[in-house]
């Protein structure tokens, strides 16, 4: 009797199905809608999880300003096709026939067109930009104290090497944190900066993926920080191709 | 990046013997743990053996305990499964796989194409 069997959870990832079934009684974990292996050790990929949830029951400093080529991700949710190591499939399609281009958050970076569209590659996302907006607090937070607080936040809860965190800006109410990660800099074994943007993003809502933690509770110096508004902004390394009419819409 | 290439799969009556064996390249072979994998037409993945790095460590399943042996060659990058006193239930697509163990859970990361293994009676 190992304490694998005694706690077969992943604690990284609430929406798996976990069985003491592995090599020497291990806990074996796979994550809802695609059954595939997931690794608890560390987060799991933003397109196994946005499988499982669409799989589970329906329920003077200055800011930083998005580039004309940022995307946001507007079309909200849906069962995508991931490959076998769990990354997004450059191209996505719903039931209809609709298929269109995404990047490695999943965010859709083409118009949408008919099976016969084609996505030659995967584009990376390298730079994400959060932008917070924060409840009314006494005064405004000292800027160093909360930029070491979300440094510390994404390299202790989320497992992001801090040299991918390349900026975090205040101007109150706004915060806007900058994550930064080339093809060429992310190693073997190092998160990827759009899975710990997704679960920074469904902590801030109240929705951790984490197992059996509490929610997130964001403080400097003591000082709750409350979120009130997140935008999200992606940026990848090739520019995304709609077309002039979806621009000037 | 990282391949696997099975073969040695094929069509074995019951109570046949079949080697599988799987090429590595794209990471350090000689210090991964690695694992066979098979899966049967409308079923889940289900492990069938485990090898540490340097191969002083196996695991197996008890369906499969006895009649199957993993074993490697970090000298040629290559997996091994020998697989004996086969059953109509053995018949699946085998894979291997880099594998992880840790105290309390086990994984695999990547899985090569897989080779088909049918058993007839």
């Known amino acids: 009797h190992t304490a694998a069997q005694d706690n077969c959870t992943c604690p990284t990832n609430k929406m798996t199905v976990c069985s003491p079934d592995g090599p020497g009684g291990r806990c074996q974990c796979r994550a809802l809608g695609s059954g595939m292996a997931v690794d608890c050790s560390t987060l799991t990929s933003k397109c196994l999880l946005l499988k499982a949830r669409m799989s589970a029951p329906k329920n003077a400093r200055t800011l930083v300003r998005p580039s004309e080529h940022a995307l946001v991700d507007n079309d909200g949710l849906y069962d995508p096709d991931c490959d076998p190591e769990g990354r997004f499939k450059a191209r996505q399609c719903n039931q209809t026939s609709v298929c269109w281009c995404v990047n490695s958050v999943g965010v859709r970076r083409t118009d949408k067109g008919d099976l016969s569209l084609r996505c030659d590659e995967l584009v990376r996302t390298h730079h994400i930009l959060i932008d917070l907006r924060h409840r009314p607090t006494a005064g405004a937070f000292n800027h160093s104290d909360l930029d070491a607080e979300l440094r510390r936040l994404f390299r202790e809860r989320y497992r992001l090497h801090p040299k991918f965190v390349a900026a975090v800006h205040y101007e109150q109410p706004t915060i806007q944190i900058e994550l930064r990660q080339n093809t060429s800099q992310k190693a073997a074994g190092d998160v990827d900066i759009g899975d710990a943007a997704y679960y920074f993003e469904r902590d801030i809502k109240g929705e951790s993926l984490f197992q059996g933690r509490g929610g997130l509770d964001l403080r400097v110096r003591g000082e709750p920080l409350q979120v009130e508004r997140t935008l999200i902004y992606y940026l990848d390394e090739i520019p995304p191709k709609f077309s002039m009419k979806r621009l000037t819409a | 990046q990282v391949q696997l290439q099975e073969s040695g799969g094929g069509m074995v009556q019951v109570g046949g013997s079949l080697r599988l064996s799987c090429a590595a390249s794209g990471f350090p072979f000689s210090s991964a743990d690695m694992s066979w994998v098979r899966q049967a037409p409308g079923k889940g993945p289900e492990w069938v053996s485990y090898i540490n790095a340097d191969g002083s460590k196996t695991y197996y399943p008890d369906t499969v305990k006895g009649r199957f042996t993993i074993s490697r060659d970090n000298a040629k990058n290559t997996l091994y499964l020998q697989m004996n006193s086969l059953k109509p239930e053995d018949t699946a697509v085998y894979r291997c796989?880099?594998?992880?163990?840790?105290?309390?859970?086990?994984?695999?990361?990547?899985w090569g194409q897989g080779t088909q293994v049918t058993v007839s009676s």
């Open positions: 796989a880099r594998a992880k163990l840790t105290d309390t859970h086990y994984v695999e990361d990547y």
